[in-house]
């Protein structure tokens, strides 16, 4: 039940009013109206939406709605000399090139500006050579091919398939590979659902569409030519040649069509197994180089775009509180895409702008909020969450001291299976309370709360009759402040079923067929599954803005951490015969970790018995639950990614949308067998784990009573 | 012309220890695996394991994991197969034979050694 | 591992006749399946390989064909020296592989 107080609408009603009056019918003209045109970061197209954003969010009632400009670094492919790759004969000639646009879908053939498939920030370049194929290009993919197989993709072109993990890590391994570009492409394993047509009449993917998207590995520094400050007037701007997280090959993507041509001719070694095949025609052979009668044949990369520093522009919308307008809850999500952006993003889009629209009917009647919520319409979340990092680094200072909570809204759904949520350990209980007052819309399931089909449908794999909350990794614009700045973030969307539908994201993912056609003829015609959306992420932004006490629950977290323990022990456990060479041990880590827990109790005892008539021991109690999460940041970061500060969390280093716990440990354990200098390695181990000692107890501390 | 000469057949005892070996000529020989494989008099072909001259990387089919050692010494272009203790049934012959690729079939072979274990 | 079974253990055909030998797998290995011919005191011989490539010098009234689980060597028009036998190989699980237990080929 909401814990919310009344301002001017009684209490019980103050939740159930905002929820009633988010309709299914405005998400649909929403995303209707944002999903005409393409609107790329720096076009005029996405300025004019942000403009009109601003105009309606002022309708709607929101206090005050500012742009905030910044001139960060994006990437355009060159208008006049087109990106491809051809197959080269022994002469030099081009006995075939792959396609330069994706043919458009019905009805959108005259809309001008669609961006041709490329992978924003490639440098530009004329690579020729033999091919190998890499597999998804993850780590272990390259550590099969090269240290187990013996093959050497130094100098070569290596061409990967899309999916698994995020495609700058692929880039990453593949210039450490020592490879001289990188072709991307889906593969319909990954891409096409089995007995499902392709788009227009399914949600699959064609074999002529291709997923665009950026190749960067900034590791959370926003703008590579800014990082740590705002890309405003007066920054002082990088070289290029300093920028951060700009990849050193070229790299292009391509459909399933265009593939098939090149990987019919591989030859050399055949891939190590069958987890490394496809569903295309081809052998799926290793290379290098074509085979027997096509040995003579070349591939060769002609990629021409452009990066150059370009305007953007955020939304800023503000909702006043009513008691604490200095405690700030966020709800922000991009506006940019990269054609139409059906589901990516303006299905979250939609659903923020009828969050907005529905606070801001009971603005009018004369309700506020407790605390301020600030809402967030976020550019260039394509090119790099470069939007939302500019904004944060300008408004660090007070975001630190005043940032309660940020919900992230980019898609509303993924699938229309089942909830998906990522979040704060201290989100956990809001969340499960929240989705059991919330009514399931799957089929099935009527009358039922989402939180019963939720859990019937993603099991948690711990705890029995709980459903699954992930770690938040990267990836999206919640990384900043969660990251960086220790901001309590969660996320929620619906989703695919994972068990049967293994393909990597959607099928259409970032390619001109995501329309608002797919969106109301395929995923979800009468506006449901996103309307629940709606309804998670505003419901959440609700209690995190009005209730008296903060919904978080640091009790969760001490059950996380413990658990996070004994996985990165089992890890080091591995190497029983290092740790005791190095004297390598956990005890202070577990210690920490048995303080916090029982510190978390007793907080929680107190929380619960206080005397919430007296405002200044209210504020100081929801002071210590606000900046629990930011007492997890280690100023200093993690080594050689000093914007990723967060000791518990942080994207994987070998894939950015997955979060790793304990990463400071984890990385240094990573491949430790491997290292030159084993006694340097396992002390860069202890290293880790005094630091992660000393945040867990240093967070505990900050549970304790305050004198 | 890549070639590979094994040395020549070998009479022994059981409990007895044995090295034979394998030549290559013709090619790069730290460029590309070797495998040996057993034939057993009137039997068919069992892979037994791979060795990658260039650094002496080797993997073992399960069957013979620590019932034979292969080794490289990439310096005279040579991979050996070696037993320490040898049974009656290891009486057979064995070939050596190159990868084509890392993973890919045997594009050449030796001309086998026979081994025969006798007491 | 990948189970291989060869089928007939033996093969009984007349020269200039079509000879057709089998090669089934346990699981599927895509293309990944050699064929070689072993005569009476010699090493074994590539023949084929990504289940129908010829290696150089072979003639061509050897062939190979299949994907995936069904794999079949054929010799259009045969002749006496063809008279061997036929070994199938998967290299699809690396560093594993694995032989068929053969099919003998006797010209009548």
């Known amino acids: 039940k909401s814990s919310s107080e009344a301002t001017n609408i009684t209490p019980k009603h103050n939740m159930k009013a905002f929820l009633d009056e988010l309709k299914a019918e405005n998400i649909k003209k929403f995303l209707h109206n944002f999903t005409q045109i393409p609107h790329l970061a720096g076009t005029e197209q996405n300025f004019q939406l942000a403009k009109q954003i601003q105009s309606q969010w002022k309708e709607f009632g929101l206090d005050s709605v500012e742009l905030t400009h910044y001139d960060v670094l994006l990437s355009y492919p060159n208008k006049t000399h087109p990106n491809y790759i051809s197959i080269i004969n022994e002469d030099g000639n081009e006995i075939f090139n792959t396609s330069l646009f994706e043919p458009p879908p019905a009805g959108y053939e005259n809309v001008s500006d669609i961006v041709p498939p490329f992978s924003a920030f490639s440098p530009q370049g004329m690579p020729e050579g033999d091919l190998v194929y890499v597999n998804y290009a993850r780590t272990e993919d390259f550590f099969k091919l090269e240290r187990d197989m013996k093959i050497n993709c130094s100098g070569k072109i290596v061409i990967a398939r899309y999916g698994k993990v995020f495609r700058g890590n692929k880039v990453k391994n593949a210039q450490l590979a020592g490879a001289t570009g990188v072709i991307l492409y889906s593969d319909p394993a990954d891409y096409f659902a089995p007995g499902v047509k392709s788009y227009p009449d399914g949600w699959n993917l064609p074999g002529g569409g291709v997923q665009r998207g950026n190749i960067l590995n900034l590791n959370g520094a926003g703008d590579p030519l800014t990082p740590g400050y705002p890309a405003n007037e007066y920054a002082y701007r990088r070289g290029m040649a300093e920028a951060v997280g700009l990849p050193s090959i070229p790299v292009h993507p391509i459909g399933y069509y265009d593939a098939q041509k090149l990987l019919e001719k591989m030859g050399g070694s055949a891939s190590p197994d069958s987890s490394w095949r496809g569903s295309l025609k081809v052998p799926y052979n290793v290379g290098p180089g074509f085979t027997g009668n096509f040995s003579t044949q070349k591939v060769k990369m002609h990629i021409h775009s452009t990066s150059e520093v370009t305007r953007i522009y955020n939304v800023i919308g503000t909702l006043r509180g009513a008691v604490e307008p200095d405690r700030y809850v966020i709800l922000g999500g991009h506006r940019d895409s990269w054609v139409f952006g059906g589901i990516d993003p303006q299905s979250g889009a939609a659903v923020v702008h009828e969050i907005v629209r529905s606070f801001g009917t009971l603005k009018k009647e004369g309700w506020r909020p407790r605390r301020t919520i600030l809402f967030a319409s976020w550019d260039a979340e394509e090119f790099g969450l470069l939007g939302s990092t500019e904004w944060a680094e300008e408004n660090s200072r007070l975001l630190q001291e005043r940032g309660v909570a940020y919900i992230n809204a980019d898609s509303s759904i993924e699938g229309n299976y089942t909830l998906r949520v990522d979040c704060t350990p201290l989100m956990y209980s809001l969340v499960y309370n929240l989705t059991k007052e919330l009514e399931s819309p799957d089929e099935g399931f009527e009358g039922k709360s989402l939180y019963e089909s939720w859990t019937k449908k993603s099991p948690s794999p711990e705890f029995s009759g709980m459903p699954r909350i992930s770690k938040l990794g990267s990836g999206n614009d919640f990384e900043v402040f969660f990251q960086r700045l220790g901001i309590a973030s969660g996320r929620a969307r619906y989703t695919k079923n994972w068990e049967t539908n293994k393909f990597s994201s959607y099928p259409l993912y970032h390619s001109v067929y995501e329309t608002y056609e797919l969106v109301e003829k395929f995923y979800d015609p009468m506006f449901k599954y996103h309307l629940t959306v709606a309804q998670v992420r505003g419901g959440m932004v609700f209690e995190l803005a009005n209730s008296v006490v903060l919904p978080f629950d640091c009790r969760d977290y001490a059950v996380v951490l413990r658990k996070y323990a004994d996985k990165i022990y089992n890890i080091s456990m591995k190497h029983p015969q290092e740790m005791k060479t190095y004297s390598v041990s956990f005890d202070s880590l577990f210690s920490a970790v048995k303080n916090f827990t029982e510190i978390a109790s007793k907080f929680s005892e107190r929380l619960r018995d206080f005397d919430k008539s007296n405002p200044i021991l209210l504020r100081m109690m929801n002071d210590q639950l606000m900046f629990l999460e930011r007492a997890f940041i280690d100023p200093l970061g993690l080594p050689d990614r000093p914007f990723y500060r967060h000791v518990i969390y942080a994207p994987s280093s070998h894939n950015k949308y997955a979060g790793e716990s304990f990463p400071g440990i984890y990385d240094a354990l990573f491949d430790i067998e491997s290292k030159v200098d084993p006694s340097q390695a396992w002390g860069e181990v202890k290293r880790q784990i005094s630091v992660a000692t000393f945040t867990v107890q240093a967070a505990a501390e900050t549970l304790s009573e305050v004198a | 012309e890549v070639q590979l000469v094994q040395s020549g057949a070998e009479v022994k005892k059981p409990g007895e220890s044995l090295k034979i070996s394998c030549k290559g000529s013709?090619?790069?020989?730290?460029?590309?695996?070797i495998g040996w494989v057993r034939q057993m008099p009137g039997k068919g072909l069992e892979w037994m394991g791979i060795?990658?001259?260039?650094?002496?990387?080797?993997r073992y089919s399960p069957s013979f994991q620590g019932q034979v050692t292969i080794s490289a010494d990439k310096s005279i272009s040579t991979a050996y197969l070696q037993w320490s203790s040898l049974k009656a049934s290891d009486t057979a012959m064995y070939y050596c034979a190159r990868r084509m690729a890392a993973a890919g079939p045997f594009d050449y072979w030796g001309q086998g050694t026979l081994v025969t274990v006798s007491s | 591992g990948i189970v291989m079974t060869q089928s007939p253990a033996t093969l009984s055909v007349s020269p200039g006749e079509r000879a057709t030998l089998s090669c089934r797998t346990s699981?599927?290995?895509?293309?990944?399946l050699a064929w070689y011919q072993q005569k009476p005191g010699q090493a074994p011989r590539l023949l084929i390989y990504?289940?129908?490539s010829r290696t150089t010098g072979i003639p061509a009234r050897f062939s190979g064909s299949g994907s995936g689980t069904e794999f079949t060597l054929t010799i259009s028009s045969l002749q006496s020296e063809d008279s061997a036998v036929y070994y199938c190989q998967h290299y699809d699980n690396w560093p594993m592989c694995s032989f068929g237990q053969g099919t003998e080929l006797e010209i009548k």
């Open positions: 699981q599927s290995i895509g293309w990944n």
């Open positions: 990504g289940a129908s």
């Open positions: 060795i990658y001259p260039g650094d002496s990387d080797t």
């Open positions: 013709g090619y790069s020989f730290t460029s590309y695996w």
